[in-house]
Structure formats: structure tokens, C-alpha cells
Interface confidence: low
């Protein structure tokens, strides 16, 4: 075998598994995949004492390469200290060395969302003598965070003793307030709230910005539903314009494609709302292959009373893909409701968030109005989840006691569907699962409502739930309520239909 340098991995326990009164704790360093012997493992413990033990090298059967583990035991009081394991492999090179610096234990964590909110001006657009900026640090696994305010990148001398932290369920939120004089605010400086947490830095910035968006008029553009895309194979996208003032001028909605290719014929609908405003929708059929291959579609909204055109565009969601897991449950009989039962379907850990949910009985799809399905919410992992609820009658389950919950999602294989059968009386009829694999872990859910408008909300964990790995990003759905100057013209959005 040829010379191969080792891969080095820190070995730590989960912090929650180490008793607070532990007298000693052990951490390790794994050097693996090297050839030939030997490796030299040393520990840098700073000024702290510890005992080390390096285990004899073992041979990796398939490759003939070697692996070894070195263990360091230190006092339990030092559990929060950092230690460095230094691995040298002179056969690779006389100066080959790999350092790993880590603490005794590691935590799964959900990083924070950082957002600055600012006090509003009065109705006439005039700023008060002082302006308050509020830094919201939300949705993170409880732990030490440091908040710093910056003015044009320079650290400000701010009293942070007013920062307050609250905990809701498994996640924490902190807020810090900064008060500025009107003079400072109007000077066009940038203010940044910088948060340091678990070795990473997260921040948000704000500055006074011009009010350049046409007030009151909003446009949204939907993506095709997975059901229309993969099952019906006739996907459509819809451009929705709301809060238009009825007037003599005509609202024009024009469709185009980024590729420059022609678009299909669209259908248009106008609706007068109770509050006197006008809502206009235009629905455009799109090619299944065009959409899947990443074509971008644009909707342009013009009106004589708009200072400028509104442009919205949509395309297939990018990023990692993960197929949904589907679990279906029947609720037990409830006193006084012997002739009705509720079925529930949990669909989780899918990416991206676009999903269609259907219920079937007797091989026939039930109307969408029969079931109620939540908008996708982020899990504590990197995917999304939804719940769907179906009420069934005794007549239905006595005719055939098998109901199927089906999820349509682009990552599901082989046919973009995953389904699970459920029976009201499971002892009498067994439900079978198709395209269903047991999950590696079940995640405990909490999060915020995805869609419009944004709403707070938690969710009930699965009864057998245990917490899996934490998210390595900041959760949260898009919001429309932004300063267009900051968002560079086109605010992102997600359309979930009229409320």
C-alpha cells in the first residue's frame, strides 16, 4: 500500500449525557486511514493536568490502513475548557501534522435568526427625536450569546444590561435595544446587531431607507403544486395582485420567460373585495419539462396609478432534496362521537417545501375540501413538515376500513409519491405502507407558520419523539413586510392562496 496520511476526528460526548457532578471526563482523538505506522498523538491541555492513553493501532480490514485512538481524561470541572489533539505522521512528511481543538462535550444546536426592528415614524413621515432599534435574536438552542451593536462596522458603547432573554419550549429568544438620536439616524449610517453564538457570527443591519415601493399594492406569484406537476402533468402558476383601488385605469398582467421563449395563453379573473379593493389573478399553464428543467417565469404588473411596474418571478426551488416520511394515525373513539373518527397524517423531513397532500378511499381521491392540511413548517433539522387531518364517517369505514394518505413531492421515488394506509379499527384491517422507509430519527418539532401572513405557532411532538441533530442555519419563512430599498426592488415571497 502507498503512503497515506491520517484523517483526524475529535471524539466527544453529548453535553446532556455528562452529569453536572462528574469528577472526571474523557475525550478522544481518532486517527484513521493512515499507512504506514506510526502516528504520534499529543495533547495540548494548556496549564491543566490530564492523563492520556493511546490505544494500539488496529488494521482496517479492507484497505490495510491503520487506525488508532488517543484518550485524554481531565477533571470534570474542566468540561468547558478547550483542548487540542495534535497528530503527527512522519511517513507522510516530516512536518505532517493535523490539529483538532475542541471541548469535552458537544451540543446539537439550532442557530438564531437575527432581525433588527425599528420604531416607526409618525403618520406624516417625520422621525421622532429618538429612534429605537430592537435586535431580535430568536429560535436558538439555549446557550451563551454575545450581542454587539456596530455603527458603520465600528463597535458602539452600548449598555447591554437591558437585553432580555426568554425561553419557549426548547428554544430561546433574546432582544437588545439601541436608542439613537434623530441626527445619527438621518446621517445614513448603517447599524448592525452582531450575535456570536457557538463559535459562529450572525448579524443583521439596517439604515434609514427611502419609501420607494408603490404603497398598498402587492403582487405574489405561486409555484405549481407537485400534484399538478407530477400527477395531473398540467402545472400552472398564478400571479395575484391585491389591494388595488378600483379606478378607470386597467391593470395589465404580462407574462414572460427568462429564456425568451413564448408563453401559453393565460386566464384572468377580477374580484371586488368587501373592503372595496380589487384583486386580480392571472393563471398561466407552464410546460412540465420546462419547469423541471429550471425555466424562470415572470409576471409584470402595470397600472396608470402605479409609479412603476411590479415584477415578480418564480422558478423551481434550488438547494438540497429530501423525500418525505409519511405516518398516518387514527384517533381513538371519543365519547359522543361514535359515528365519526379523525385521521391524522404527519409528513416530515422533506426538502424543498413544495408538497401536495391527498387522501384516498376505495382507490378514489377524496375532494380537497374534505381534509385540512397545514402549511409547511421548518423542522429543527433541515427539512419541513406538515400535518393533514381528515374526518371520516362510520358509513365510510364500514364500507372499507382503509384510508390512504398520499404525499406528492419531487424527491419521492420512484413516482414522486409516498403513501401510508391507516384503518379506523386496525385490528380488523391491516394498513400497508408503500414507498415507506423507517426514519433514521424522529425530530421534535417547533417552528413558525410558513406562508402568508406570518404567524407564531408551535407543534406537538410525535409521542415517540426524541431530538435529532440541530439545524445549521437560521429558520424562518419569507416576510413581505420589508423596506424595498433594502431588498433591492423585488422582495421574495411565498403565495399560499387567499385567506
Amino acid at each position: 500500500a502507498s503512503t497515506q496520511s491520517p484523517s483526524v476526528f475529535p471524539l466527544t460526548r453529548c453535553c446532556k449525557n455528562i452529569p453536572s457532578n462528574a469528577t472526571s471526563v474523557t475525550l478522544g482523538c481518532l486517527a484513521t486511514g493512515y499507512f504506514p505506522e506510526p502516528v504520534m498523538v499529543t495533547w495540548d491541555t494548556g496549564s491543566l493536568n490530564g492523563t492520556t492513553m493511546t490505544l494500539p493501532a488496529t488494521t482496517l480490514t479492507l484497505s490495510g490502513h491503520y487506525a488508532t485512538i488517543s484518550l485524554l481524561t481531565v477533571s470534570g470541572a474542566w468540561a468547558k475548557q478547550m483542548f487540542t489533539c495534535r497528530v503527527a505522521h512522519t511517513p507522510s512528511s516530516t512536518d505532517w501534522v493535523d490539529n483538532k481543538t475542541f471541548s469535552v462535550c458537544s451540543r446539537d444546536f439550532t442557530p438564531p435568526t437575527v432581525k433588527i426592528l425599528q420604531s416607526s415614524c409618525d403618520g406624516g413621515g417625520h422621525f421622532p427625536p429618538t429612534i429605537q432599534l430592537l435586535c431580535l435574536v430568536s429560535g436558538y438552542t439555549p446557550g451563551t450569546i454575545n450581542i454587539t451593536w456596530l455603527e458603520d462596522g465600528q463597535v458602539m458603547d452600548v449598555d447591554l444590561s437591558t437585553a432580555s432573554t426568554t425561553q419557549e419550549g426548547e428554544l430561546a429568544s433574546t432582544q437588545s435595544e439601541l436608542t439613537l438620536s434623530q441626527k445619527h439616524w438621518l446621517s445614513d449610517r448603517t447599524y448592525t446587531c452582531q450575535v456570536t453564538y457557538q463559535g459562529h457570527t450572525f448579524e443583521d443591519s439596517t439604515k434609514k431607507c427611502a419609501d420607494s415601493n408603490p404603497r398598498g399594492v402587492s403582487a405574489y406569484l405561486s409555484r405549481p403544486s407537485p400534484f399538478d406537476l407530477f400527477i395531473r402533468k398540467s402545472p400552472t402558476i398564478t400571479c395575484l395582485v391585491v389591494d388595488l383601488a378600483p379606478s378607470k385605469g386597467t391593470v395589465n398582467l404580462t407574462w414572460s420567460r427568462a429564456s425568451g421563449k413564448p408563453v401559453n395563453h393565460s386566464t384572468r379573473k377580477e374580484e371586488k373585495q368587501r373592503n372595496g379593493t380589487l384583486t386580480v389573478t392571472s393563471t398561466l399553464p407552464v410546460g412540465t419539462r420546462d419547469w423541471i428543467e429550471g425555466e424562470t417565469y415572470q409576471c409584470r404588473v402595470t397600472h396608470p396609478h402605479l409609479p412603476r411596474a411590479l415584477m415578480r418571478s418564480t422558478t423551481k426551488t434550488s438547494g438540497p432534496r429530501a423525500a418525505p416520511e409519511v405516518y398516518a394515525f387514527a384517533t381513538p373513539e371519543w365519547p359522543g362521537s361514535r359515528d365519526k373518527r379523525t385521521l391524522a397524517c404527519l409528513i416530515q423531513n422533506f426538502m424543498p417545501e413544495d408538497i401536495s397532500v391527498q387522501w384516498l378511499h376505495n382507490e378514489v381521491q377524496l375532494p380537497d375540501a374534505r381534509h385540512s392540511t397545514t402549511q409547511p413548517r421548518k423542522t429543527k433539522g433541515s427539512g419541513f413538515f406538515v400535518f393533514s387531518r381528515l374526518e371520516v364517517t362510520r358509513a365510510e369505514w364500514e364500507q372499507k376500513d382503509e384510508f390512504i394518505c398520499r404525499a406528492v413531492h419531487e424527491a419521492a421515488s420512484p413516482s414522486q409519491t409516498v403513501q401510508r394506509a391507516v384503518s379506523v379499527n386496525p385490528g380488523l384491517a391491516g394498513g400497508s405502507a408503500q414507498s415507506q422507509r423507517a426514519p433514521d430519527r424522529v425530530l421534535c418539532h417547533s417552528g413558525q407558520q410558513q406562508g402568508l401572513p406570518r404567524a407564531a405557532g408551535g407543534s406537538v411532538p410525535h409521542p415517540r419523539c426524541h431530538c435529532g441533530a440541530g439545524r445549521a442555519d437560521w429558520p424562518g419563512p419569507p416576510e413581505l413586510d420589508v423596506c424595498v430599498e433594502e431588498a433591492e426592488g423585488e422582495a421574495p415571497w411565498t403565495w399560499t392562496g387567499l385567506c
Epitope: V114, K115, T192, Q194, E203, S205, A487, E488
Partner: nanobody, 116 residues
């Protein structure tokens, strides 16, 4: 239309180097924190490196610290990931992610393969 486009991936030998680029369009780039993630086949997504918006503060995942460097050029709407001393376990699809407040965008990913 918001787009993130990664480039610079490819096949490289262990110990070699690659420089990934992520070009953004349709957003005010300087507002956004940039994160590189990677996902190896059959494994969960892993945070590689973060560079913040206003101050370009950087931080790294444990497995790449000391070998990878993240940077950004706001004038060119581009983020970079310089990857040195590459190892076979760095093989993955590398994704660029841009975040500002609750806005989040992903690139399509670029494949990096480290093999002799």
C-alpha cells in the same frame, strides 16, 4: 429574479486545492450573510463556512477549520470558498446559501470530488 450560481467544483487529488465561487444576482448582496454547505451522498447537510454581511466576520465548521477560507467581494456580488489540503472526505456537493433576515436563497450546487 434571484439567482445564486456556484462554480469551480471538479475532480482534484488529495492534498490539492480548489476555489469555489458563488455569484448572486437579483439581491442587494452586501445585506446578506453567505454560508457554504455541503452534502455528501447519504449524509445530512453540513455547515462548512459562514461570512457575515456588514462586517465580513468568518467562522468555520470543525472539519474544515484551518484548511478552508471563505471571503466575499461585494462589488462583484460574489462569495468565494478557497479549499486547501483537500481530503477524500471533502467529496460532496457544495451549496451556496444567502440569508438576510428571513430571506433565504440556495444555489444549485457544485460537485467536488477528491480522489487519487
Amino acid at each position: 429574479d434571484v439567482q445564486l450560481q456556484e462554480s469551480g467544483g471538479g475532480l482534484v487529488q488529495p492534498g490539492g486545492s480548489l476555489r469555489l465561487s458563488c455569484v448572486a444576482s437579483g439581491i442587494r448582496f452586501s445585506n446578506y450573510g453567505l454560508t457554504w454547505y455541503r452534502q455528501a451522498p447519504g449524509k445530512s447537510r453540513e455547515l462548512v463556512a459562514v461570512i457575515s454581511s456588514a462586517t465580513s466576520t468568518t467562522s468555520y465548521g470543525d472539519s474544515v477549520r484551518g484548511r478552508f477560507t471563505i471571503s466575499r467581494d461585494n462589488a462583484k456580488n460574489t462569495a468565494f470558498l478557497q479549499m486547501n489540503s483537500l481530503k477524500p472526505e471533502d467529496t460532496a456537493v457544495y451549496y451556496c446559501n444567502a440569508r438576510w433576515r428571513d430571506y433565504e436563497y440556495w444555489g444549485q450546487g457544485t460537485q467536488v470530488t477528491v480522489s487519487s
